[in-house]
C-alpha cells in the first residue's frame, strides 16, 4: 500500500534570467528511493539515482544544475520555461510518486515567488 | 583523448592471485563511475564489478560470482584502476575489459585475457 | 541464464532496416532504462544507445532504441555490412546492486 505523500513548491514564478530551485519532498513512507525523474512536460530534464548519481540531458546540460539534495536548479530563464514540472519518485517497494510544480517565468521584475527556493 | 589501456592479464593456476591495472587518460577515475566487465572465450558480457565516482557515494559493487574474491580499487595519483583477483577458477577465464560511466558504459578500454588453467 | 531475453541471431541485406528485441519482465525492462552496446568483431564493446533511446554523439542516426512495456528494441535502418557485429542490451539492476547483460545477438549482413 503506498502511503507516502509529495510535498512540492507548487505553483512558483520567477524572472526571466533569473534562477529557481524546483524541489519536492516524499514524506510518510519508508520506501526507498532508488532514482527520481525531472521531467518537463514528456521531456526528460535529469535523473538522480541513488547508484549511479546524476544525469543530466544534454539538451539541458547549459542551464540544469543538480541539486540541492534531489532538487533541480534551472538556469537563465527564459519564457519558454514557463509550464509543468514533475518530479517522480521511484520507490521500492511503494512504487512510484509524482509530484507537479507550475512555473511562470516572467518578463517584468515583478515576479513573485516562494523566497526559500528563489536564487538571486 | 579519452583512453583506457588495460594491463596485467596472462596465465594464472586456479587458485592463484592477479591484480589488473587500467590506465586512465584524458579524465580523472575518481570523479567517475568505473567498471570491470569481462567476456569468455565465446560468450557474451557479463559485468564484474563497478566502482562510483568519489564526490558521489564512493560505493564498490560485485557480481555475486565474484563477491569475496575479487577486489576493485582505484590509486588516484596514478589515475589507474584495479582489480584484484584471488582465488581464481577456470570459470574465471575471460577478457577482462574496463569501462568508464555511469548512465552506460561510454568508453572501453582494448581488453586483457585472463587464463585459468593448471 | 540471463533475466533479459535476445534471440541469438539476427541478419538482414545491406540497406535494409532490422531489429533486435530485448524481452524481460516488468521488474526489470519496465521499470528500468536500457542501454545498447555493439561490439565489432575482436574489438570492444561499445556504447550504442542510453536511457532507452538516447545516442551518444558519434552514433549515426540509424541506430535507434526503443521501450514499451517489458519489451526494448534496437533497430538499424539502412544496414551497412559494417553493421555486422555482435548487440547487447543492458539495465542497471537497483535491487542487485549491478549491471545485467543480454545474452546478446549475433547480427549478420548478407
Known amino acids: 500500500m503506498m502511503t507516502g505523500t509529495i510535498e512540492t513548491t507548487g505553483n512558483i514564478s520567477a524572472e526571466k534570467g533569473g534562477s529557481i530551485i524546483l524541489q519536492c519532498h516524499l514524506s510518510s513512507t519508508t520506501a526507498q528511493v532508488t532514482q527520481v525523474n525531472w521531467e518537463q512536460q514528456d521531456q526528460l530534464l535529469a535523473i538522480c539515482n541513488a547508484d549511479l548519481g546524476w544525469h543530466i540531458s544534454p539538451s539541458f546540460k547549459d542551464r540544469v544544475a543538480p541539486g540541492p539534495g534531489l532538487g533541480l536548479t534551472l538556469q537563465s530563464l527564459t519564457v519558454n520555461d514557463t509550464g509543468e514540472y514533475f518530479c517522480i519518485y521511484h520507490t521500492y517497494p511503494d512504487g512510484t510518486y509524482t509530484g507537479r510544480i507550475f512555473l511562470e517565468v516572467l518578463e517584468s521584475s515583478v515576479a513573485e515567488h516562494g523566497a526559500r527556493f528563489q536564487i538571486p | 583523448e579519452v583512453q583506457l589501456l588495460e594491463s596485467g592479464g596472462g596465465l594464472v593456476q586456479p587458485g592463484g592471485s592477479l591484480r589488473l591495472s587500467c590506465a586512465a587518460s584524458g579524465f580523472t577515475v575518481s570523479s567517475n563511475w568505473m567498471s570491470w566487465v569481462r567476456q569468455a572465450p565465446g560468450k557474451g558480457l557479463e559485468w564484474v564489478s563497478t566502482t562510483s565516482s568519489s564526490s558521489w557515494n564512493n560505493y564498490t559493487y560485485y557480481a555475486d560470482s565474484v563477491k569475496g574474491r575479487f577486489t576493485i580499487s582505484r590509486d588516484n595519483s596514478k589515475n589507474t584502476l584495479y582489480l584484484q583477483m584471488n582465488s581464481l577458477r577456470a570459470e574465471d577465464t575471460a577478457v577482462y575489459y574496463c569501462?568508464?560511466?555511469?548512465?552506460?558504459?561510454?568508453?572501453w578500454g582494448q581488453g586483457t585475457t585472463v587464463t585459468v588453467s593448471s | 541464464q540471463s533475466v533479459l531475453t535476445q534471440p541469438p541471431s539476427a541478419s538482414g541485406t545491406p540497406g535494409q532496416r532490422v531489429t533486435i528485441s530485448c524481452s524481460g519482465s516488468?521488474?526489470?525492462?519496465?521499470?528500468?532504462?536500457l542501454y545498447w552496446y555493439q561490439q565489432l568483431p575482436g574489438t570492444a564493446p561499445k556504447l550504442l544507445i542510453y536511457?532507452?533511446?538516447q545516442r551518444p554523439s558519434g552514433v549515426p542516426d540509424r541506430f535507434s532504441g526503443s521501450k514499451s512495456g517489458t519489451s526494448a528494441s534496437l533497430a538499424i535502418s539502412g544496414l551497412q555490412s559494417e553493421d555486422e557485429a555482435d548487440y547487447y542490451c543492458a539495465f542497471w539492476d537497483d535491487h542487485l546492486k549491478g549491471w545485467v547483460f543480454g545474452g546478446g545477438t549475433k547480427l549478420t549482413v548478407l
Open positions: 536511457l532507452n533511446d
Open positions: 569501462a568508464k560511466g555511469s548512465y552506460g558504459m561510454d568508453v
Open positions: 516488468n521488474s526489470n525492462i519496465g521499470a528500468k532504462y
